[in-house]
């Protein structure tokens, strides 16, 4: 009987010889539980596990805590991989996070964090980031130090408001902070002066809602 090979992330998939972009089945660390993820095997050397993608507004990102925990959407299009998987994965070894952004004028930019991990659910999947480089702003648009994750039914932000209800989507809101890549998707010519759009403040400023975003992770020693 042939032993089935399991992969923890897209870097392991890549190293096994699968170097084509696409959806692969990954396995939770120290578990048999599986999850489907999109692997980018071309960008920057490949081996990237896509943990978030926005591109056309086809998926509703105003979801519950549980949905953000387990993931939602379609890995071939707009989706959220799932906080629980990402938390478990990024606590096994050191990962980098690359955030790729597109605006409506044809420009692209990225933010690269040399160390990224999420705390456990008990700590509200708090985000931890170090070492920012890239073209999408010299200051991190994800507030530092990192904040707890908040959703419409899980209010962990610092605002007297509920950021997830005000701005829509689950995110590591501060009060409410300079970014929200899970905000409302606004089409071209409707994407300015939107306080609840897809925001990366230190690249495009206040009120600009982006055309496309991708969040991807890869082991630091890849």
């Amino acid at each position: 009987k042939e032993e089935q090979i399991s992969f923890r992330d897209c870097a392991e998939v890549f190293k096994s010889g699968h170097t084509t972009n696409g959806i692969y089945t990954l396995t939770f660390p120290n578990s048999t539980e599986e999850i489907k993820a999109y692997c980018d095997m071309e960008a920057g050397g490949g081996g990237w596990t896509i943990i978030q993608r926005r591109e056309d507004g086809s998926v509703d990102f105003q979801r519950t805590w549980k949905e953000y925990k387990v993931g939602f959407g379609n890995p071939s299009g707009e989706y959220w991989l799932g906080n629980e998987f990402v938390s478990q994965l990024t606590n096994q070894q050191r990962y980098v996070l690359k955030i790729h952004l597109k605006d409506w004028e044809g420009n692209e930019a990225y933010s690269l964090y040399e160390h990224f991990y999420l705390s456990s659910e008990e700590l509200n999947y708090r985000i931890h980031l170090k070492g920012l480089t890239g073209t999408a702003g010299k200051i991190s648009s994800i507030s530092q130090p990192g904040n707890d994750f908040s959703t419409k039914d899980g209010d962990n932000d610092k605002c007297i408001c509920k950021c997830s209800q005000m701005l829509t989507g689950g995110w590591w809101f501060d009060a409410c902070g300079p970014s929200n890549l899970n905000g409302m998707y606004y089409p071209q010519r409707q994407n300015t002066n939107k306080f609840n759009g897809i925001k990366w403040y230190y690249w495009k400023g206040s009120g600009y809602s982006l055309k496309a975003t991708t969040m991807m992770i890869r082991p630091a020693d890849f």
């Epitope: 507030s143 610092k158 605002c159 007297i160 408001c161 509920k162 950021c163 005000m166 701005l167 501060d174 009060a175 409410c176 902070g177 300079p178 002066n193 306080f195 403040y201 206040s206 009120g207």
Partner: antibody, heavy 120, light 108 residues
Framework: EVQLVESGGGLVQPGGSLRLSCAAS????????IHWVRQAPGKGLEWVAG????????YYADSVKGRFTISADTSKNTAYLQMNSLRAEDTAVYYC?????????????WGQGTLVTVSS | DIQMTQSPSSLSASVGDRVTITCRAS???????VAWYQQKPGKAPKLLIY???SLYSGVPSRFSGSGSGTDFTLTISSLQPEDFATYYC?????????FGQGTKVEIK
């Protein structure tokens, strides 16, 4: 028509207590946070406290924490500010205001104010 | 606590003048949480601008707000006699809520 009417102000000795009332009409106070803002004579605006007590959200300025308490009686559509251990520096006109939690995200309606004087 | 530093603290201007008041926050603020109020002596404050730049219902269009991040501005394009008052910026995001110290607009 939305209206807020404060009452309960007056002269009180240091260490004394007062309860201010904010009677609302034109809206239901359980639907909106009520905030309290004060203004000492000749000074600027200072936020004191606010929130939705029924919903478990209450916030206080450090200067009044432990001495002031906000509450509400939804049957009377009235919010209250209980002020204990009053000090001379609490002397001010006190305003209640409705805080809208969507748009406009601001205090859109204010009461006329009630004067609290703390003096011996 | 977030400090809201307003400038100038007072200014003298004539009817028809363009007046600009600035407010600097001590840390990043989501624009939707910044408001401007007008207060006349012996009266309660009135909301002018919310969300840093949106004109509140019934407020004349000569008032406008702008800014983002930490720097916000209130502009009166052509000062009218009824505009002589004190103006306050305010952040409503983090407890304690904080106001600027006020800008008194006086007749020159």
């Amino acid at each position: 028509e939305v209206q807020l009417v404060e009452s309960g102000g007056g002269l009180v000795q240091p260490g004394g207590s007062l309860r201010l009332s904010c009677a609302a009409s034109g809206f239901t106070i359980s639907d909106y946070p009520i905030h309290w803002v004060r203004q000492a004579p000749g000074k600027g605006l200072e936020w004191v406290a606010g929130g939705t007590p029924a919903g478990g959200y209450t916030y206080y300025a450090d200067s009044v924490k432990g001495r002031f308490t906000i509450s509400a009686d939804t049957s009377k559509n009235t919010a209250y500010l209980q002020m204990n251990s009053l000090r001379a520096e609490d002397t001010a006109v006190y305003y209640c205001a409705r805080f809208v939690f969507f748009l406009p995200y601001a205090m859109d309606y204010w009461g006329q104010g009630t004067l609290v004087t703390v003096s011996s | 606590d977030i400090q809201m530093t307003q400038s100038p603290s007072s200014l003298s201007a004539s009817v028809g003048d363009r007046v600009t008041i600035t407010c600097r926050a001590s840390q990043f603020l989501s624009s939707f949480g910044v408001a401007w109020y007008q207060q006349k002596p012996g009266k309660a404050p009135k909301l002018l601008i919310y969300g840093a730049s949106s004109l509140y219902s019934g407020v004349p269009s000569r008032f406008s707000g702008s800014g983002s991040g930490t720097d916000f501005t209130l502009t009166i394009s052509s000062l009218q006699p009824e505009d002589f008052a004190t103006y306050y910026c305010q952040q409503g995001l983090l407890s304690p809520l904080t106001f600027g110290q006020g800008t008194k607009v006086e007749i020159k």
